[in-house]
C-alpha cells in the first residue's frame, strides 16, 4: 500500500520537519501551508484549519513563501539622482540604482539608499581609480611629463607632445606647445577615456585598490557630503 | 527557499565554550528573522535565541541569557551562536531555522532548518 500523504494541517512525526512550503507553526504545533510570494496569511492555521491567504494590497509585496500576517511596504519613490530598476509590484520591492556619473555612497537591502556624484579631478589631476556603482573616483597629480588640462570624472593624465623644438613646456595641467615644425607624440600608454561605471542590478563588487597619491575622501553621514578632495571639484 | 547547515558542535568540558554556525544558501539570510533552536534527548524543542528580520532586536532563554550571544553576517549569509560558561544541561542538538520577515521573538513558527549539531558538556 502507499503511504498516506497527509494533509495540512497535520502534526509532524518526532524528529521530522515539514514538508516544501509548509512550517511548523509554534502555537497550532502542527505543519501548515505557507503563503505564495505575493500572498500574505490572512488567517493563521490552528489545529484543525489551514492557513488562510490573500494577495498583497497597492504598494505591498511579499517575495518569499511565507505566512506573515501584513505584506511589506515597498520602498518610497527612487530619488531624482536614481533609476528605478525594478518597479514595486506584489511579488517584489522597488529597486532604485544610481543614474550615469553618480555612485551609491550609502547601500541598503538592494538597491542604493543614498547616491552621490562621481568626483572630477580638476586639470593638473587625472583620474587614478575609475568610479564603480559603490565607490568614488580617485584623483592623483599628474606626473612630470604628463598632464591633464580638463575638469572630469574619467580622464587620465596624458603624455606630454614631444616637440623638434619646444616653443612652451608643458606642465601638469598644459600640454608642450610646438613651433611650427610637426610635433611626435609620445607612445606612452594611456591616453584614453575611462568609462563612467553603468548602474546595473547585478552584485555590486568592490574594486581593487590601486596605490594613489591623492586620498579618497568618503561620505560621512549624517552630515553632508565632505569638502572636495586634493584635485577634485564637486562640479 | 533556504537551505541551512549547522556547524561547530562538539564535546566540551563545563565552563567551556563553542560557536555555532549556520550557513544559509538558496536566499538571502537577512530576508528572515532566524532563532537557534535545541533539542534535548526526551525533551520539547526550545528555542534558544532569537534575531529579527530587521535585525533591531535579539530573544535569550532565560536559561542562557548573558552566557550565548546571537549574531549574524548578512555579507557572509551566515549565522552565529557564540556559547559560553556551558553547562551539562546545555547538551542538546542545536538547529538552527527561520522565519521570512519575521518581526518579533520568539519566532511565531519554523521554516526550514539544518541537520543539526550536537553540543556535548561532560567533564
Known amino acids: 500500500l502507499p503511504a498516506q500523504v497527509a494533509f495540512t494541517p497535520y502534526a509532524p512525526e518526532p524528529g521530522s520537519t515539514c514538508r516544501l512550503r509548509e512550517y511548523y507553526d509554534q502555537t497550532a504545533q502542527m505543519c501548515c501551508s505557507k503563503c505564495s510570494p505575493g500572498q500574505h496569511a490572512k488567517v493563521f492555521c490552528t489545529k484543525t484549519s489551514d492557513t488562510v491567504c490573500d494577495s498583497c494590497e497597492d504598494s505591498t509585496y511579499t517575495q518569499l513563501w511565507n505566512w506573515v500576517p501584513e505584506c511589506l511596504s515597498c520602498g518610497s519613490r527612487c530619488s531624482s539622482d536614481q533609476v528605478e530598476t525594478q518597479a514595486c509590484t506584489r511579488e517584489q520591492n522597488r529597486i532604485c540604482t544610481c543614474r550615469p556619473g553618480w555612485y551609491c555612497a550609502l547601500s541598503k537591502q538592494e538597491g542604493c539608499r543614498l547616491c552621490a556624484p562621481l568626483r572630477k579631478c580638476r586639470p593638473g589631476f587625472g583620474v587614478a581609480r575609475p568610479g564603480t556603482e559603490t565607490s568614488d573616483v580617485v584623483c592623483k597629480p599628474c606626473a612630470p611629463g604628463t598632464f591633464s588640462n580638463t575638469t572630469s570624472s574619467t580622464d587620465i593624465c596624458r603624455p606630454h607632445q614631444i616637440c623638434n623644438v619646444v616653443a612652451i613646456p608643458g606642465n601638469a595641467s598644459m600640454d608642450a606647445v610646438c613651433t611650427s615644425t610637426s610635433p611626435t607624440r609620445s607612445m606612452a600608454p594611456g591616453a584614453v577615456h575611462l568609462p563612467q561605471p553603468v548602474s546595473t542590478r547585478s552584485q555590486h563588487t568592490q574594486p581593487t585598490p590601486e596605490p594613489s597619491t591623492a586620498p579618497s575622501t568618503s561620505f560621512l553621514l549624517p552630515m553632508g557630503p565632505s569638502p572636495p578632495a586634493e584635485g577634485s571639484t564637486g562640479d | 527557499e533556504v537551505q541551512l547547515v549547522e556547524s561547530g558542535g562538539g564535546l566540551v568540558q563545563p565552563g567551556g565554550s563553542l560557536r555555532l554556525s549556520c550557513a544559509a544558501s538558496g536566499s538571502r539570510l537577512d530576508y528572515y528573522a532566524v532563532a537557534w533552536v535545541r533539542q534535548a534527548p526526551g525533551k520539547e524543542l526550545e528555542e534558544v535565541s532569537c534575531?529579527?528580520?530587521?535585525?533591531?532586536?535579539?530573544n535569550y532563554a532565560e536559561s542562557v541569557k548573558g552566557r550565548f550571544t546571537i549574531s549574524r553576517d548578512n555579507s557572509k549569509n551566515t549565522l552565529y551562536l557564540q556559547m559560553n560558561s556551558l553547562r551539562a544541561e546545555d547538551t542538546a542538538v542545536y538547529y538552527c531555522?527561520?522565519?521570512?520577515?519575521?518581526?518579533?521573538?520568539?519566532?511565531?513558527?519554523?521554516?526550514?532548518w539544518g541537520q543539526g549539531t550536537l553540543v556535548t558538556v561532560s567533564s
Open positions: 534575531i529579527t528580520y530587521s535585525g533591531g532586536s535579539t
Open positions: 531555522t527561520t522565519e521570512p520577515y519575521g518581526s518579533s521573538c520568539p519566532l511565531s513558527g519554523y521554516d526550514t
